[in-house]
Interface confidence: medium
Amino acid sequence: AWELTILHTNDVHSRLEQTSEDSSKCVNASRCMGGVARLFTKVQQIRRAEPNVLLLDAGDQYQGTIWFTVYKGAEVAHFMNALRYDAMALGNHEFDNGVEGLIEPLLKEAKFPILSANIKAKGPLASQISGLYLPYKVLPVGDEVVGIVGYTSKETPFLSNPGTNLVFEDEITALQPEVDKLKTLNVNKIIALGHSGFEMDKLIAQKVRGVDVVVGGHSNTFLYTGNPPSKEVPAGKYPFIVTSDDGRKVPVVQAYAFGKYLGYLKIEFDERGNVISSHGNPILLNSSIPEDPSIKADINKWRIKLDNYSTQELGKTIVYLDGSSQSCRFRECNMGNLICDAMINNNLRHTDEMFWNHVSMCILNGGGIRSPIDERNNGTITWENLAAVLPFGGTFDLVQLKGSTLKKAFEHSVHRYGQSTGEFLQVGGIHVVYDLSRKPGDRVVKLDVLCTKCRVPSYDPLKMDEVYKVILPNFLANGGDGFQMIKDELLRHDSGDQDINVVSTYISKMKVIYPAVEGRIKFSTGSH
């Protein structure tokens, strides 16, 4: 028998520095977790102790903190090279800055293979990108070889900016011939490494003949066997075992997100490359693991540029940006309108002639808007200003919801109106009218939404049975502020871009902003 140790990360999202337990900015260093310096310590410890070790990443290194905003992927290549990753799969967020923003900083700089079997380049891009990413890679490990085959969510064109010259094929259809090719090369130990979410990971394990192990990402799935060491609740045991259509037991793993854990899977293969056993658990990278001094010193050196960036002007406002509790928790506020407009603008994807855009709606809990911005400071808006407005390091995500769920959400928005509670919703692409004289649960008297399947956008009444795409904070997608109906009833959830980054990009693009209060949220006469 031959034993392989797979160390894996996914959805790190720019968390190069250690973070607090909830993956936001580290405040109390003695209780902080993750970060590449700490990850390196643990990886090196395992590499020294065990003979056959692979370090893999399942995508979405890009996007999530000011590190990515400033360094645009150069930081990913630099520190992944320093940690000596063996392979990476492309995630949807790797395309956030377009194909050029992937090629120059990462694909050309990475000293490890970057993989995806279901992305096919066409037109002029085909020759430009040729060889920079691969469908699979055969890696020597000890005296054996291991095949790694990559995959990426086929929803990427709706979630990021891959352009028109990349085709995202069905994962299973694309993977099978590549795995077959590896078999003809006498590679009998094959890992599928990719970024399509836990449901697709399980399907790949079930349907793709010859895949021995699936290492996934995208859905931030936490798997654990035994008592979990932190706040994350396991979605199943680690590894999650899938019985394939040809009767094999295929381990599927994922390691939550944000570099908080290092996935640790030990696989035993027989001489024919069959998996005999698999066991392990994610390792919580808490403060009991010291940060590697040399990587930490490097982080501190790269950090200097970030501090300078956060005080630079992104754009100007010529109006007061009212992000006060008094406004945003009680009525339409122009800071809410600005943020929602930025969220929609960040999701412009003209992928179909029938639709002006795939999504037109935004909702945002007023309690998530934490500060106003005064225009009397020469109108200057900095990253620092925006960090006060959006201090939680969340993301603006894409979900699909039925109209009936949206209606419940808007009822929840005002179910105890007047208490300055955070659930009061700010909106974009939505016109809502409340009657507060009615009883809670029956206060929404009008709810119109902006059409998407139209050449001239206009507002139509919400249809209860129709499925709508909505952009919202990950906090709401996870049921925060009492929006349990969103969490329970959402039909699809894809994590998006860092909240501050979305707004800062929009302000930089617009140069001068002047958001108004324009009647998106109204109260019928006599009730307000």
Epitope: R370, S371, G418
Partner: antibody, heavy 121, light 107 residues
Framework: QVQLVQSGAEVKKPGASVKVSCKAS????????INWVRQATGQGLEWIGW????????KYNEKFQGRVTITVNTSISTAYMELSSLRSEDTAVYYC??????????????WGQGTTVTVSS | DIQMTQSPSSLSASVGDRVTITCRAS??????LAWYQQKPGKAPKLLLY???TLASGVPSRFSGSGSGTDYTLTISSLQPEDFATYYC?????????FGGGTELEIK
């Protein structure tokens, strides 16, 4: 570690005012609400009001409206509760308590040690 | 204003006993309810929130249940350090009132 440290005991005459301070440390002061709660000797707890330090927004228990003022000084991470027109029934231990300002979970997770205010002629 | 009524106001029990304290609201508080423990001369300590979520570091012998207007705090097996006064508090609409307290003493 996260803590709220309150000012020392006060003895006041009826009709006077008292101002109690609450200094926060170990967390980002502007991200959490500060609440004030009082407890008369041998009695239960009574909520007075709260402030959101980032923008100074306050909400008071109507029972105290007009007599209570809650303020903050963010530069020193300190909240204040001033109660005026004191009467003997205001004799109590006054607590400050932190509430998560955003995450949708409602509770007071960190409390000050309490400040005894005695109103006596 | 929503009034919170706790019962019993005092309770004698022994180490190892299972104890239940109830809290009734005068209106629906929709699970926006927290439970606290207070020992003499000390500030209250958070036990549970959202009616049934255990606060960080609180032993699992404490549990909460209920919905609407009626809520319960249960201690499955009393320990010596559990003898204290317990308060419920709602967060539905201001003022956020507390229950009158339940004093738990050693039998």
């Amino acid at each position: 570690q996260v803590q709220l440290v309150q000012s020392g005991a006060e003895v006041k005459k009826p009709g006077a005012s008292v101002k109690v301070s609450c200094k926060a440390s170990g967390y980002t002061f502007t991200s959490y609400d500060i609440n004030w709660v009082r407890q008369a000797t041998g009695q239960g707890l009574e909520w007075i009001g709260w402030i959101y330090p980032r923008d100074g927004f306050t909400k008071y228990n109507e029972k105290f409206q007009g007599r209570v003022t809650i303020t903050v000084n963010t530069s020193i991470s300190t909240a204040y509760m001033e109660l005026s027109s004191l009467r003997s029934e205001d004799t109590a231990v006054y607590y400050c308590a932190r509430k998560e300002g955003y995450r949708g979970d409602w509770y007071f997770d960190v409390w000050g040690q309490g400040t005894t205010v005695t109103v006596s002629s | 204003d929503i009034q919170m009524t706790q019962s019993p106001s005092s309770l004698s029990a022994s180490v190892g006993d299972r104890v239940t304290i109830t809290c009734r609201a005068s209106g629906n508080v929709h699970n926006y309810l927290a439970w606290y423990q207070q020992k003499p001369g000390k500030a209250p300590k958070l036990l549970l929130y959202n009616a049934k979520t255990l606060a960080s570091g609180v032993p699992s012998r404490f549990s909460g249940s209920g919905s609407g207007t009626d809520y319960t705090l249960t201690i499955s097996s009393l320990q010596p350090e559990d003898f204290a006064t317990y308060y419920c508090q709602h967060f539905w609409s201001t003022p956020w009132t507390f229950g009158g307290g339940t004093e738990l003493e050693i039998k």
